[in-house]
Amino acid sequence: AWELTILHTNDVHSRLEQTSEDSSKCVNASRCMGGVARLFTKVQQIRRAEPNVLLLDAGDQYQGTIWFTVYKGAEVAHFMNALRYDAMALGNHEFDNGVEGLIEPLLKEAKFPILSANIKAKGPLASQISGLYLPYKVLPVGDEVVGIVGYTSKETPFLSNPGTNLVFEDEITALQPEVDKLKTLNVNKIIALGHSGFEMDKLIAQKVRGVDVVVGGHSNTFLYTGNPPSKEVPAGKYPFIVTSDDGRKVPVVQAYAFGKYLGYLKIEFDERGNVISSHGNPILLNSSIPEDPSIKADINKWRIKLDNYSTQELGKTIVYLDGSSQSCRFRECNMGNLICDAMINNNLRHTDEMFWNHVSMCILNGGGIRSPIDERNNGTITWENLAAVLPFGGTFDLVQLKGSTLKKAFEHSVHRYGQSTGEFLQVGGIHVVYDLSRKPGDRVVKLDVLCTKCRVPSYDPLKMDEVYKVILPNFLANGGDGFQMIKDELLRHDSGDQDINVVSTYISKMKVIYPAVEGRIKFSTGSH
């Protein structure tokens, strides 16, 4: 028998520095977790102790903090090279800055293979990108070889900016011939490493003949066997065992997100490459693991540029950006409108001639807007200003909801109106009218939404049974501020870009902004 140790990360999202327990900015260092310096300490410890170790990443290193905003992927290549990753799968967020923003900083600089079997380049891009990412890679591990085949969410064109010259094929259809080829090349130990979410990971384990292990990402799935060491609640045991259609037991793993855990899976193979046993658990990278001094010093060196960036002007406002709780928790506020407009703008994807865009609606809890921006400072807006408005380090995500769920969400928005509570919704692509004289749960008297399947966008009444795409903060997608109906009833959830980054990009693009209060939210009683 031959034993392989698979160390894995996924959805790190630019958390190069250690973070607080909830993966936001580290405040009290003695309680902080993750970060590449701490990760390196643990990886090196395992590499020294065990003979056959692979360090893999299942995608979405890009996007999430100011590190990505400033360094645009160069930081990913640099620190992943320093940690000596063995392979990475492309995630949807690797395309956030377009194909060029993937090729130049990452694909050309990475000293490890970057994989995806279901992304096919066409046209002029085919020759430009040829060999920079691969469908599979065979790696020497000790005296054996291990094949690693990559995959990426086929929803990527709706979630990011891969352009028109990359085709995202069905994962299973694309993986099978690559795995078959590895088998003909006498590779009998095969890992599928990819970024399509836990449901697809399980399907790959079930359907793709010849895959021995699946290492996934995208859904931020936390798996654990035994008592979990932090706040994350396990979605199942680690590894999650899937019985394949040909009767094999295939371990499937994922390691939550944000570099908080290092996935640790031990697999025992027989001489023919069959999995005999698999066991392990994610390792919580808490402060009991010291940060590696040399990596930490490198992080501190790279940090300097971030501090300079945060005070530079992104654009100007010629109006007061009202982000006060007195406004945003009670009525339409222009800061809410600005943020929602930025959220929609960030999700412009012309992927179908029938649709002007795939999504037109935004909702945003007023309590998530934490500060106004005064225009009387020469109109200057900096990253620092935006960090005061959006201090929580969240993301603006894409969900699919039924109209009936949206109606419930808007009822919840005003169910205890007047108490300055955070659930009051700011909107984009939505016209809502409330009647506060009615009883809670029955206060929405009009709810019109901007059409997407139209050449001239206009507002139509919400249909209860129709499925709509909506952009919203991850906080709401996870049921925050009492929006349990969103969490419970959402039909799909894809994590998006860092909140501040979305707004800063929009402001930089617009150069001068002047958001107005324009009647998105109305009250039918005379008192408002």
């Epitope: 060999g131 691969l134 065979v138 020497p140 005296d143 070889v145 090349l185 006498n186 590779v187």
Partner: antibody, heavy 119, light 107 residues
């Protein structure tokens, strides 16, 4: 059918350089690891170097490490061996060999090219 | 570094006889052992890989056995074309070594 044809052999002085090539045909070159193996006149076989199918990993015998460099051009279906700081003991027939199973099956061998290092 | 030894250095036999060639590694090489045949003026030819698997086109009279440090190549009934030099070869950590060879000649 699989064919491996070595070229570039000849006489070189000690301390000088020589470059060998191996033209491959009859198979998908980019799918296979490739080796150089040498045989001094009247002696046994000695492994020299291995290069991975797409060139990402290289391995060398201690006797040539730091002096010889294996490389490949998959677009030209060609394997190379750059030999620097040549010594008399490098005199041998150099064989280009296909690896069909990750070091376990050196299944096709060229006919070899003779390198003579002499002053 | 793993050293390979082969015995005997020379084996003198007649056609039709059984030939048993031995190969020993200085430390375990698992199953990563191959056997090659070389005739004068020719390139070597792969006979056996992974200690016991016959290569494509190799007659059934050739068989390999063993694991760890001790390996054997058996030619059940020598044919005239089998008289040649036989080399064993191991790989460990992607470093390859050949044995010194056993010459099988006609008695």
């Amino acid at each position: 059918q699989v064919q491996l044809v070595e070229s570039g052999g000849g006489v070189a002085q000690p301390g000088r350089s020589l470059s060998l090539s191996c033209a491959a045909s009859g198979f998908t070159f980019s799918d296979y690891g490739m080796h150089w193996v040498r045989q001094a006149p009247g002696k046994g076989l000695e492994w020299v170097a291995l290069i991975w199918y797409e060139g990402s990993f290289e391995y060398y015998a201690d006797s040539v490490k730091g002096r010889f460099s294996i490389s490949r051009d998959n677009s030209k279906n060609t394997l190379y061996l750059q030999m620097n700081s040549l010594r008399a003991e490098d005199t041998a027939v150099y064989y280009c060999v296909r690896d069909a199973q990750w070091g376990s099956r050196l299944d096709y061998w060229g006919q070899g090219t003779l390198v003579t290092v002499s002053s | 570094k793993i050293v390979m030894t082969q015995s005997p250095a020379t084996l003198s036999l007649s056609p039709g006889e059984r030939a048993t060639l031995s190969c020993r590694a200085s430390q375990s090489v698992s199953r990563y052992l191959a056997w090659y045949q070389q005739k004068p003026g020719q390139a070597p030819r792969l006979l056996i890989y992974d200690a016991s698997n016959r290569a494509t086109g190799i007659p059934a009279r050739f068989s390999g056995s063993g694991s760890g440090t001790d390996f054997t190549l058996t030619i059940s009934s020598l044919e005239p074309e089998d008289f040649a030099v036989y080399y064993c070869q191991q790989r460990s950590n992607w470093i390859f070594t050949f044995g010194p060879g056993t010459k099988v000649d006609i008695k």
